[in-house]
């Protein structure tokens, strides 16, 4: 689990763009808003992500919603859905 | 395969300016990411700016304001534009392109993503 720090000045991220590519780890779980990840969840399958990156952002998802991901997210996961466990998958009620 | 060669290092006086070039060869696709790394002698190699396929960048806290990365498609070349240059600036710079078709690494900020890499120009910033 990445450590809580704060965002550095100028990093936060207005919105989900490939300029996150070079955000470390802890930079991700500082500098990107959750909420904001769940409403632009179409962008991240168009950047090329990481796998380790995709796990921090997968972390933030599953503290915005740790009673299963709404569909408006589902639908979008992409490569983040390789990064689901079958206990994630449960969670989910996809109609 | 991509060729990459860095030039426009040198000796300046602190608060002084320098541009270095890259030049990729071998290709026509831009690579995913194109960026500059820095080594300073006993410590890591660093990312100092990254340039996505797409034109944004990204600039390590320890240089923002003052550098300034960009390019010319025409000419397939990168630059790293350094002003206000300081004495903790002394390092040799790397230009790396990279496109990571495996995801691997931490994240694009970490060296171990690039596949292409020049071979280093030096700067050197005097106190």
């Known amino acids: 689990e990445v450590e809580k720090t704060a965002c550095p000045s100028g990093k936060k991220a207005p919105e989900i763009d490939e300029s996150l590519i070079f955000y470390k780890k802890w930079e991700l779980e500082a500098c990107v808003d959750a909420a904001l990840l769940a409403t632009q969840m179409d962008r991240v399958n168009a950047i090329p992500f990481t796998y380790e990156q995709l796990d921090v952002l997968k972390h933030k998802l599953d503290e915005l919603y740790p009673q299963g991901y709404p569909e408006s997210v589902i639908q979008h996961l992409g490569y983040l859905f390789l990064k689901m466990s079958p206990e994630d998958i449960r969670k989910w009620n996809v109609t | 395969e991509v060729q990459v060669v860095e030039s426009g290092g040198g000796l300046v006086q602190a608060g002084a300016s320098l541009r270095l070039s890259c030049a990729s060869s071998?290709?026509?696709?831009?690579?995913?990411?194109m960026a500059w790394f820095r080594q300073a002698p006993g410590k890591e190699r660093e990312l100092v700016a990254g340039?996505?396929?797409?034109?944004?960048?990204y600039y390590s806290d320890s240089v923002k304001g003052r550098f300034t990365i960009s390019r010319d498609n025409a000419k397939n070349t990168v630059y790293l534009q350094m002003d206000s240059l300081k004495f903790e600036d002394t390092a040799v710079y790397f230009c790396?392109?990279?496109?990571?078709?495996?995801?691997?690494?931490?994240?694009?900020?970490?060296?171990?993503?690039?596949?292409?890499w020049g071979q280093g120009t030096q700067v050197t910033v005097s106190s």
């Open positions: 340039l996505t396929w797409t034109g944004r960048t």
């Open positions: 790396a392109a990279g496109d990571n078709p495996d995801r691997r690494g931490s994240s694009w900020s970490s060296s171990s993503v690039y596949e292409y």
């Open positions: 071998g290709r026509t696709i831009s690579p995913i990411a």
